[in-house]
């Protein structure tokens, strides 16, 4: 996501499964830390936002034609799993240790 | 990058190496098709934007708390190489068939 003046970084985002309607099949946890990628991808792109060549090119083009081309975007570049207790196809409480791609591990400019 | 009302998609972006100051070391091509990912990541996220679970979660949270949490972002999810003729460290024109990560192959919501 883009953010006003701050640099692309990982910020807290507590997600309650009831808020998103997933409590119908996820029994536990009730909420979890998803994190969110927030902030801008400003020139020059620092190493910590692990920019791709395309992101660097787009940033340079945006610098020259800001109204024509957008900035690169601050997004999750690495995700982590969480453990969940969910209802299987038969409704039986079942444990999945690694429910992949649910929490941000790293953010970057893409 | 985000876009007004349109759905996340790959759009044309012709990049002239002179515009970004890379003509000092890239001899050819003079310009290339970099493409750009443009458009919004709106609910519900379609399969063609290959959303991660985190992107789906963030989209649902944004739906409930639009001022607190941003939408997922439309970014390159797969990049392609281009071929370039460049000046090596000694200024000798050298061909690189696969200069990786320069052109968007696919866009998605992240």
């Amino acid at each position: 996501s883009t953010g006003a003046g701050s640099h692309c970084q990982k910020t807290s985002l507590r997600v309650n499964f009831e808020d998103i309607g997933w409590n119908s099949w996820i029994i536990a946890p009730k909420e979890y830390e998803a994190y969110e990628c927030k902030g801008g991808c400003f020139f020059p792109l620092a190493d910590d936002v692990t920019p791709t060549k395309h992101a660097i090119v787009q940033t340079l083009v945006h610098l020259k034609f800001p109204t024509k081309v957008g900035k690169a975007c601050c997004v999750p570049t690495k995700l982590s799993p969480i453990s969940i207790l969910y209802k299987d196809d038969m409704g039986v409480p079942t444990l999945k240790y690694h429910y992949e791609g649910m929490s941000v591990a790293e953010c970057g400019c893409r | 990058s985000t876009g007004a009302g349109s759905h996340c998609q790959k759009t044309s972006l012709r990049v002239n190496f002179e515009d970004i100051g890379w003509n000092s070391w890239i001899i050819a091509p003079k310009e290339y098709e970099a493409y750009e990912c443009k458009g919004g990541c709106f609910f519900p996220l379609a399969d063609d934007v290959t959303p991660t679970k985190h992107a789906i979660v963030q989209t649902l949270v944004h739906l409930k708390f639009p001022t607190k949490v941003g939408k997922a972002c439309c970014v390159p999810t797969k990049l392609s190489p281009i071929s370039i003729l460049y000046k090596d460290d000694m200024g000798v024109p050298t061909l690189k068939y696969h200069y990786e990560g320069m052109s968007v192959a696919e866009c998605g919501c992240r």
Partner: antibody, heavy 126, light 111 residues
Framework: QVQLVQSGAEVKKPGSSVKVSCKAS????????IHWVRQAPGQGLEWMGG????????YYAQKFQGRVTITADESTSTAYMELSSLRSEDTAVYYC???????????????????WGQGTLVTVSS | QSVLTQPPSVSGAPGQRVTISCSGS????????VYWYQQLPGTAPKLLIY???NRPSGVPDRFSGSKSGTSASLAITGLQAEDEADYYC???????????FGGGTKLTVLG
């Protein structure tokens, strides 16, 4: 080889509470759900409830809701079943049984109670 | 009264074949797996059949399970004296969100 060892027999007065323990050895405790099933003298098996220690999430048969509390201590691989407001009809053998909850195990086996504890006789008498 | 219905007793002579039935509904047997437990006199129940028709290691192939619609059955062939026990069927009830058992069937081996 997983083994479940339960605490000894108890004699209780009506209106009191009883707490039965079930200690697991072998296997990974966080992979289990521990369920409690009782059997009144000469009667069949009756499921009371179960707990998934990994999250501490318990669920109960409606008949026992509010009167039974199932807990677990992961550090000692022990599950507990506490039944309050005891009456003479609660006289029974109480069994704990393991169910594998990890979805890395085939669903057919994941829903089985295996193994069982040796049972704990709880007698409610004035 | 048990949610799953079993005959209270069955009997057979050594070497014979007996079957024990277990009747339920669409929310338990009809939509879920069936399990069978053997309880020898004075001992805890032991898993005999899991997932309708699978035998855990150590259970003789004389024991077999089957399921059709909202009913299940346990078949024992070549009856032996040591098979004398109580047998319970069991399934998850999707609607009630509970594990349900049959009332149990006492198997007597004659002679």
């Amino acid at each position: 080889q997983v083994q479940l060892v339960q605490s000894g027999a108890e004699v209780k007065k009506p209106g009191s509470s009883v707490k039965v323990s079930c200690k697991a050895s072998g296997g990974t405790f966080s992979d289990y759900a521990i369920h409690w099933v009782r059997q009144a003298p000469g009667q069949g098996l009756e499921w009371m409830g179960g707990i998934i220690p990994f999250f501490g999430t318990a669920y109960y048969a409606q008949k026992f809701q509010g009167r039974v509390t199932i807990t677990a201590d992961e550090s000692t691989s022990t599950a507990y079943m506490e039944l309050s407001s005891l009456r003479s009809e609660d006289t029974a053998v109480y069994y704990c049984a393991r169910r594998i909850v990890s979805d890395s195990v085939a669903v057919q086996y994941r829903h089985a109670f295996d193994p069982w504890g040796q049972g704990t006789l709880v007698t409610v008498s004035s | 009264q048990s949610v799953l219905t079993q005959p209270p007793s069955v009997s057979g002579a050594p070497g014979q074949r007996v079957t024990i039935s277990c009747s339920g509904s669409s929310s338990n047997i009809g939509s879920n797996y069936v399990y069978w437990y053997q309880q020898l006199p004075g001992t805890a129940p032991k898993l005999l059949i899991y997932g309708n028709n699978n035998r855990p290691s150590g259970v003789p192939d004389r024991f077999s399970g089957s399921k059709s619609g909202t009913s299940a059955s346990l078949a024992i062939t070549g009856l032996q004296a040591e098979d004398e026990a109580d047998y319970y069927c069991n399934a998850w009830d999707t609607k009630a969100y509970v594990w349900v058992f049959g009332g149990g069937t006492k198997l007597t081996v004659l002679g």
